[in-house]
């Protein structure tokens, strides 16, 4: 299962189907703490700092649709997010030049298992109902991600995953210098 | 040479908590995350959790959550893994270790180990 | 977690025989596979990881293979010295998991 089909949006399901937003702005004062109960239990890993937080399901409803049809009933849904965290990545400069190098692998928190539900879209101006059936998020997990995957692969989780590698300087071009430098600060 | 140099064995009684500790040394420190593992007698190995020297981070495997904090101590290398309200089947062999990486595969392993803590729990 | 089942759990052979351990998981785990060896009352030591990179100073008699889900260690000439436990541990998802063990002992 190639990387490009896990979407933090969790929805890749139907094409047409409405799409579920990216998760809300993350808050360090209202985030869902380790100690404060954190996710279900069945998470495989728990992060506890200020700074980093742990892979959990953030859990939508809302209504699917598909051109002017739309369900009969709201769909629960789950979505992937959060960091498996602590951070894996440090500091490196020569001169001012400045890239990352990780200290440890580069994990993601990304869709585990799926679930089938068949939905029922209903469509204005009399027309019959139609069914569907969706697959949606059922567990999430921290799952390795490496190097390899390239940029076009990358880019459905977010900026903080096309880092530089070990020992090398951000790829020309990828990114502007103003984000690249954001990035950087923005890593931890 | 990169050395792991951990605390001494620990008798502890059920409910207590105990604090092992792991002096690194041969390398800058802040420049790997430190990693606990134990092994019960006779049996496996299970990977605790790992802490980012520089953040403070620290991240751990949901079974010891709410039992297990790591810490650091950057002025003198050194690692800290406190496992509390301890029970019988805590009595294992703590390790602290240190990930090597393959540049050419971009892979990670445990390389470097310390020599392990015995922590025994008992009434 | 992933779990890692390595099998058999012990087995017992002479100096010279051809060993194979293997380790399976129960999701795939790509190459990110690991072996340790362990001896009584030591830390675990690293031989191979990747699946089949042998760490620098690890006799050649040891190899590795395998992806996906199922991995096999293989000692080729068993030596005095190679009588131990040896683990696999997979890099792939946290938590990292390792399997259970394979005592190997002089028959």
């Known amino acids: 299962q190639g990387w490009q089909a896990f979407r933090n949006d969790a929805t890749e399901v139907i094409p047409g189907l409405g799409e579920y937003p990216e998760p809300p702005p993350e808050n360090n004062q209202t985030m869902n703490r380790a100690e404060n109960g954190g996710r279900p239990p069945h998470h495989p890993y728990d992060a506890k700092d200020v700074s980093e937080y742990s892979c959990r399901e953030l859990h939508y409803t809302r209504f699917l649709t598909d051109g002017p049809c739309r369900s009969a009933k709201p769909v629960t849904e789950l979505v992937c997010s959060g960091q498996c965290g602590p951070a894996r990545l440090l500091p490196n400069a020569i001169g001012r030049v400045k890239w990352w190098r990780p200290n440890g692998p580069d994990f993601r928190c990304i869709p585990d298992r799926y679930r089938a539900q068949r939905v029922q879209l209903l469509c204005p101006g009399g027309a019959a109902p139609r069914s569907r059936k969706v697959r949606l998020v059922a567990s999430c997990k921290c799952k390795r991600l490496t190097r390899f995957h390239n940029q076009s692969e990358l880019k459905d989780f977010g900026p903080e995953t096309a880092r530089p590698q070990k020992g090398r300087k951000p790829r020309p071009g990828a990114r502007g210098a103003k984000a690249n430098q954001a990035e950087l600060e923005n890593a931890y | 040479e990169v050395q792991l140099v951990q605390s001494g064995a620990e008798v502890k009684k059920p409910g207590a908590s105990v604090k092992v500790s792991c002096k690194a040394s041969g390398y800058t420190f802040t420049d790997y995350n430190m990693h606990w593992v134990r092994q019960a007698p006779g049996q496996g190995l299970e990977w605790m959790g790992e802490?980012?020297?520089?953040?403070?981070?620290?991240g751990y495997n949901q079974k010891f959550k709410g039992r297990v904090t790591m810490t650091t101590d950057t002025s003198t290398s050194t690692a800290y893994m406190e496992l509390r309200s301890l029970r019988s089947d805590d009595t294992a062999v703590y390790y602290c270790?240190?990930?090597?990486?393959?540049?050419?595969?971009?892979?990670?392993?445990?390389?470097?180990w310390g020599q392990g803590t015995t922590v025994t729990v008992s009434s | 977690d992933i779990q890692m089942t390595q099998s058999p759990s012990s087995l017992s052979a002479s100096v010279g025989d051809r060993v194979t351990i293997t380790c399976r998981a129960s999701q795939d785990i790509s190459n990110y596979l690991n072996w340790y060896q362990q001896k009584p009352g030591k830390a675990p030591k690293l031989l191979i990881y990747?699946?089949?990179r042998l760490l620098s100073g690890v006799p050649s008699r040891f190899s590795g293979s395998g992806s996906g889900t199922d991995f096999t260690l293989t000692i080729s000439s068993l030596q005095p010295e190679d009588f131990a436990t040896y683990y696999c541990q997979q890099g792939d998802t946290l938590p990292y998991t390792f399997g259970g063990g394979t005592k190997v002992e002089i028959k």
């Open positions: 270790a240190r990930l090597g990486y393959d540049d050419i595969y971009d892979d990670w392993y445990f390389h470097v």
């Open positions: 802490i980012n020297p520089n953040s403070g981070g620290a």
């Open positions: 990747h699946t089949s």
